[in-house]
């Protein structure tokens, strides 16, 4: 009888062990463990009757196609073999074991007691069958084993072969290579590449097989198992393998497909091949006059650029524009994209105007193209370039006027300072209640009128100021304070004031500049009280243009101590005093108690303990402080009231040759206008110089050395 | 054309707050100032404060500073005056003024418990 | 703060004759910037608000009677009505503006 085993291990005996089995007895013994697993058997007793080869009593082991052993006796001789220690190892999972005794025994046998066992496969040590052992990588384990792959490799579906991922390779430049993968190691199994070139319409691809060729072939059947094949359009060439590479191939096509093919199996190297696009040739090309073509080849081909570019000082001229550079391509029948465009040489044209200044032409007729020279200069006396610029610009190549210092930037002209039209009287002696100026010997006087249209009626007033540049007025604080009901200090609004410069005779306003503020600034620190700090400034909303009858005064150095003591300066003022005046009659000036024409007077600066004295004497609170110095005489006089509110107190200074404002006419009094020992109270400007350049945004360096030339 | 009408009366408790309003047209409100002045029964007249428009600068009497605040909202043209911490003695009829020349018809305030 | 007092407190004058009204103030009105003194006078009836007949000491609003007329200086002005009319009974108040505005007391005028 057949007796049926599907454990992982157990035991077999002969039947009625220990005792004697009994005679003509069979017994099969099918002994089956899972896939992965091979059984190992051996004996813990063995006492079989003895026989030639066997053939009485016997335990034959076998698998279903081969007997493995046969064993009988007790002990191993030349014609019967006992199993002893002997292991006996199953190739797959199933053993089937098999007893049997024949009719008769001559003695007592006691028979045989087996155990069995399922042992582990190691599949990956095992397996010689390429077709069935992992390609790169085993993995063992109890009952199995699995394959893996390299990086870049994917496992086949046959979960042996690796093969890569290659079907979408795009190649788009005009020259390449293409190998296969991994290649100058074995390609991998079980795959399909696909390489596809495309380039441009009109380029045609060459490919060259290079160094190593070697793909798995047939010596009968022409590429059964790997191969290439190169597609061009409907027609297909190959396929290729072997060791001998394919010729060359001219495909006559932009747009090319190549197909590998791997099996399962074998170990090639592969192959690898570049690939080249050539296109039609061009006509020679010839360089423009003052030009050059880069770059500079014998011949070109289907998309070769050349940019043709000109010498220095010479631009490329195409179609009536002017470019730096000029590309030109070889199209794919052959011919050029464009002609040659010409060279011409760069023109800077006509440079720009210079506020100010003028232009002169230092080349012949007026050139205005490479390396022409042109000078730039001010409207003098009335500006002077800034840091004595020469002027001289060039046409450079780049077609922009260049000067060495300032670039591609114009000079600038800066308004001269303190030079009037007519030379102002500086030793002319006292001038008892003034005199008239003669148009021009106080370009800087500006009347400050202002018209607070938030009251009303509206408030008007007004004073003096001094032009500082040909946008700056300087002036008192007092004069462009809002008169607010308080004693807060806020500035008038910049809408309710108008500038008058070049004002001669208040009569006729025809020749004079009249300018809206744009800024009207007061110093920050202006005191109501005391008026200490009394200066201001108005920025116009406008530039006025310089002439004889318009122009800035100089700016003192910075000096705490002010004017010297007794130094002799001049103020001049329409000499508008009169408490019941309206500012309309002055701009219209249609009354008599005023003076028509703009007045002058010299004064002497009064020593500060003097005039500090004279002011301390008085009944009420005034302080002279280190920020006002005063002017006039002992003995007073009608002059000292002259000058209206926020008016320069000029001094000539000997060393730049310039008149300086170094006061502006801030306060006097509380006695009636030119009473004795009733000094005028100016502002000291050269404690302010820092702050005046500062609102005015230039540095002080930039006009500083007009004063101290 | 040019005037400056005020809100109507009020009858407020002592300690409450009260706002007159006051619309301007006819000019440029903006650029002028509007001044406020009370008048209480049978007194003369007190000046209050002032307020630009189209900066919103103000001027305070002292004896207001703490209680009044004027405001404006130029997009109605219309100025405003706010009496906080009402006494009995506030009782006035309160005017807003064109800087000197315009008067409002006035505004009674009544305080009274 | 500067203090504006009037006098008298009140004056009765006959119709056509002339009326005087007097306001000094504890400081000088005269602005030295603006050149302008900042005295303003007033009048005003029962029932409506002041109306303004006089500013910067001197100068008479436009579509007041030439009647009415201010002078003065410094710190002592005067209001004159030259010849009284009977629309002219009210209370008349001088305002300085030199500072934060204040009034004086007022003038009551009536007919005699």
């Known amino acids: 009888h057949t007796v049926e085993l599907n454990n992982m291990f157990g035991q077999i005996q002969s039947p009625g062990y220990p005792d004697s089995y009994p005679s003509d007895s069979e017994v099969t013994w099918n002994i089956t463990v899972p896939d992965g697993f091979r059984i190992k058997l051996y004996f813990m007793h063995f006492n079989l009757e003895s026989s030639y080869l066997c053939e009485y009593d016997y335990v034959k082991v076998e698998t279903e196609d081969q007997v493995l052993a046969t064993f009988c006796g007790r002990e191993t001789t030349d014609t019967e073999q006992t199993p002893g220690q002997e292991v006996v190892l199953s190739p797959g999972s199933f053993m089937s074991i098999t007893f049997r005794s024949d009719f008769s025994n001559e003695e007592r046998f006691t028979g045989f007691d087996a155990h069995y066992m399922a042992v582990d496969v190691d599949e990956c040590k095992e397996r010689e069958d390429e077709e069935l052992s992992c390609d790169h990588y085993c993995h063992n384990y109890i009952g199995g084993y699995y394959c893996s792959c390299r990086f870049g490799y994917i496992l086949h579906t046959d979960n042996r072969t690796c093969r890569v991922e290659c079907s979408d390779n795009l190649f788009t430049q005009r020259t390449g290579v293409i190998t296969s993968p991994d290649f100058p190691n074995p390609y991998p199994k079980s795959s399909e590449c696909l390489y596809t070139i495309e380039l441009e319409e009109g380029f045609m691809v060459n490919l060259q097989f290079e160094d190593i060729f070697d793909i798995e072939d047939h010596p009968e059947v022409p590429c059964p198992y790997d191969y290439i094949k190169i597609k061009v359009g409907p027609k297909v060439l190959g396929p290729f393998c072997g060791e001998k590479a394919p010729e060359p191939i001219s495909t006559q096509s932009h747009s090319v497909l190549i197909l590998f093919h791997s099996d399962n199996s074998g170990e090639n190297r592969g192959w690898r091949l570049s690939y080249r696009a050539a296109g039609n040739e061009c006509p020679e090309l010839q360089p423009p006059v003052h030009g050059k073509i880069e770059p500079s080849q014998a011949k070109y081909f289907f998309k070769d650029q050349v940019l043709v570019s000109c010498d220095t000082g010479y631009k490329v001229l195409k179609d009536n524009v002017e470019m730096d550079t000029f590309q030109i391509e070889c199209l794919k029948d052959g011919t050029w994209s464009n002609k040659i465009p010409t060279c011409k040489i760069v023109d800077c044209r006509a440079p720009g105007e210079l506020e100010h200044g003028l232009i002169t032409f230092s080349t012949r007729n007026n050139l205005t193209t490479y390396k022409s020279e042109i000078k730039y200069s001010c409207q003098e006396p009335y500006y002077k370039m800034l840091n004595n610029n020469t002027g001289i610009y060039t046409c450079s190549a780049q077609g922009v006027w260049m000067n060495k210092v300032l670039g591609r930037s114009l000079p600038t002209c800066l308004p001269e300072c303190g030079q009037p039209s007519r030379s102002l009287p500086s030793l002319v002696k006292r001038i008892i209640g003034g005199r008239n100026a003669e148009p021009g010997l106080f370009p800087w006087q500006a009347l400050i009128v202002v018209e607070d249209t938030s009251r009303v009626p509206n408030d008007k007033w007004f004073g003096s100021g001094a032009l500082l540049s040909a946008s700056w007025i300087l002036t008192a604080a007092h004069v462009l304070r809002s008169q607010r009901r308080d004693t807060t200090v806020i500035p008038v609004s910049k809408e309710h004031v108008t500038v008058y410069l070049g004002l001669h005779d208040v009569r006729d306003k025809s020749g004079a500049v009249n300018s809206s503020a744009a800024r009207v600034v007061l110093h920050p620190d202006f005191n109501i009280q005391n008026y200490n700090h009394d200066i201001a400034l108005v920025q116009l909303q406008e530039p006025v243009p310089l002439g004889p009858h318009v122009m800035p005064v100089c700016l003192p150095r910075l000096e705490p101590e002010g004017p010297a003591p007794h130094m002799l300066g001049l103020v001049a003022g329409w000499g508008i005093s009169n408490p019941n005046v309206t500012v309309d009659e002055i701009i219209s000036s249609g009354t008599r108690t005023l003076s028509d024409v703009l007045q002058y007077v010299k004064l002497p600066v009064v020593p500060h303990a003097e005039c500090k004295t004279s002011y301390e004497s008085r009944s009420g609170n005034y302080s002279v402080t280190e920020n006002m110095f005063c002017a006039g005489y002992y003995e007073g006089g009608k002059d000292t009231c002259l000058g209206d509110s926020g008016g320069a107190f000029v001094i000539f200074d000997d060393l730049s040759q310039r008149w300086v404002v170094q006061g502006l006419v801030s306060w006097g009094g509380p006695e009636e206008c030119g009473s004795k020992q009733v000094y005028g109270v100016y502002t000291k400007v050269s404690n302010y110089v820092d702050w005046v350049w500062e609102q005015m945004g230039l540095p002080q360096s930039v006009v500083e050395p007009q004063v101290e030339r | 054309q040019v005037q400056l009408v005020q809100s109507g009366a009020e009858v407020k408790k002592p300690g409450a707050s009260v706002k007159v309003s006051c619309k301007a047209s006819g000019y440029t409100f903006t650029g002028k100032w509007i001044e406020w002045v009370r008048q209480a029964p049978g007194q003369g007249l007190e000046w209050m404060g002032e307020?630009?428009?189209?900066?919103?600068?103000?001027d305070y009497n002292e004896r207001f500073k703490d209680r009044a605040t004027f405001t404006a909202d130029t997009s109605t043209s219309t100025a405003y005056m706010e009496l906080s911490s009402l006494r009995s003695e506030d009782t006035a009829v309160y005017y807003c003024v064109r800087s000197e020349d315009l008067w409002g018809q006035g505004t009674l305030v009544t305080v009274s418990s | 703060d500067i203090v504006m007092t009037q006098s008298p407190d009140s004056l009765a004058v006959s119709l056509g004759e002339r009326a005087t009204i007097n306001c000094k103030s504890s400081q000088s009105l005269l602005n030295s910037v603006t050149r302008k003194t900042y005295l303003a006078w007033y009048q005003q009836k029962p029932g409506q608000p002041p109306k303004l007949l006089i500013y910067w000491a001197s100068t008479r609003e436009s579509g007041v009677p030439d009647r009415f007329s201010g002078s003065g200086s410094g710190t002592d002005f005067t209001l004159t009505i030259s010849s009284l009319q009977a629309e002219d009974v009210a209370v008349y108040y001088c305002?300085?503006?030199?500072?934060?505005?204040?009034f004086g007391g007022g003038t009551k005028v009536e007919i005699k």
């Open positions: 307020i630009l428009p189209g900066s919103g600068s103000t």
């Open positions: 305002k300085q503006s030199y500072t934060l505005p204040t």
